[in-house]
Interface confidence: low
Amino acid sequence: FNISGCSTKKLLWTYSTRSEEEFVLFCDLPEPQKSHFCHRNRLSPKQVPEHLPFMGSNDLSDVQWYQQPSNGDPLEDIRKSYPHIIQDKCTLHFLTPGVNNSGSYICRPKMIKSPYDVACCVKMILEVKPQTNASCEYSASHKQDLLLGSTGSISCPSLSCQSDAQSPAVTWYKNGKLLSVERSNRIVVDEVYDYHQGTYVCDYTQSDTVSSWTVRAVVQVRTIVGDTKLKPDILDPVEDTLEVELGKPLTISCKARFGFERVFNPVIKWYIKDSDLEWEVSVPEAKSIKSTLKDEIIERNIILEKVTQRDLRRKFVCFVQNSIGNTTQSVQLKEKRG
């Protein structure tokens, strides 16, 4: 097909030779076509399109990608010729960097349903080059981690050496969707949640006297938490003796703080020591009374419906455990005098 009518976009991928890096191209069809029909602007309000639109705003998966060989050969179907490039809906993923990725990439709808659809295509001229030694040594990584529950930021690798004042306007995408409010070289995340994870793309325009290019970088963002290095601590009971009245009901609460663990299997239980006997007690279920992203306070009560003489000779032991270790706190009941 004739690609002369395709809109053209120039992109620059400057890759680091020190790290693994990915790159993406979006099928950036002109906005009217992207959002509804390629030929919608040619219809009067009362006209009805003869055919269904080739692409709706919510479904950009029916596109075909081609590469235009530099020697003028016919267009090549990406899927057949380039195993290191994969298509995911309207996005083309480059799994490995290299200058051999330079070239012209064309995307268009798979189904051409009307003469107008022929011009519904975009040509992306991609230039790929390694970062020079003169480039910023401490540029942001293409793999960035955000700590859950804390403040974090996502930096645009190709601009991370520039101050905010020097930085050009940046266009950010997350998982292929435009983040219209983000315009600087750094996205500040006030509080990190798991939904902040994903593939972020930052674009900015670089111009010279002849032409302008979109400089693009891709950042894989992972939301993580640091596993606790501490065993749980018992917040309550604090004292090892408790004054009680015989024949009265009694609830002893065990509250323990567990640091965050990705694989979280907290243990909180009561057992009784009576002479040389020791047995675990069937008590109400443990309940979480406070949960943050960093830790969790869990409570489990032991209920004595009546305190007996026998109970005064027992030790009531709260046992808590995580993957690091365990802690215990024992309570001896003492009859209240007077």
């Epitope: 009265k248 007690v281 008590v283 009546k306 026998r310 109970d311």
Partner: antibody, heavy 122, light 111 residues
Framework: EVQLEESGGDLVQPGGSLRLSCAAS?????????ICWVRQAPGKGLEWVAC?????????YYASWAKGRFTISRDTSKNTLYLQMNSLRAEDTAVYFC?????????????WGQGTLVTVSS | DIQMTQSPSSLSASVGDRVTITCQAS??????LAWYQQKPGQAPKLLIY???KLASGVPSRFSGSGSGTDFTLTISSLQPEDFATYYC?????????????FGGGTKVVIK
Amino acid sequence: EVQLEESGGDLVQPGGSLRLSCAASGFSFNGNYYICWVRQAPGKGLEWVACIYAGSSGSTYYASWAKGRFTISRDTSKNTLYLQMNSLRAEDTAVYFCVRDKPAGGSSYTLWGQGTLVTVSS
Amino acid sequence: DIQMTQSPSSLSASVGDRVTITCQASEDIESYLAWYQQKPGQAPKLLIYQASKLASGVPSRFSGSGSGTDFTLTISSLQPEDFATYYCQCTLYGVNFVPNVFGGGTKVVIK
């Protein structure tokens, strides 16, 4: 006067169900004691059936043979104890007593109802 | 579950006799034991709780003793109104509720 009065005893066929009630007067079904059901088959001894704690937890306890078939419950607003009996068998024929224990010194039953007779027979 | 074994299952006695009924627990229940008296067609009545404490309104001729596994109910001088069936009961409770098991009963009849 502090007393317990059972009702609901009847002749029922094997496999049938019955709900016994026990109305309390002179005290509230909300305190530091157990309210229980004890039964006595004709000419036999006393057999503990189930207890419910009258405190806020409302913990329930059952004799091993009663678990799954019998359910003890209370309605504090009506000051009434219940025993729901399902899948009744001939051996469940007995006088069912509603009892309340002593607030201290062990779970000894200081207060007994007059009993209600349940007969399971075809 | 704890088992309570009462003996004898029946005994014949005369008014004025000293009567002793024993109850054995299958495990140590300390002093968590009660004794009841039941007359035909009536509900049982608490006589003794915590092995040796006399319930309210119970005549002093009734007494209880023992702890651990072996318990005794003694009627120092049998009265006509004492001819009845007597039951012991484990009244132990704690964190794990112990079923309130009764002994098999001892029937005291006139000789």
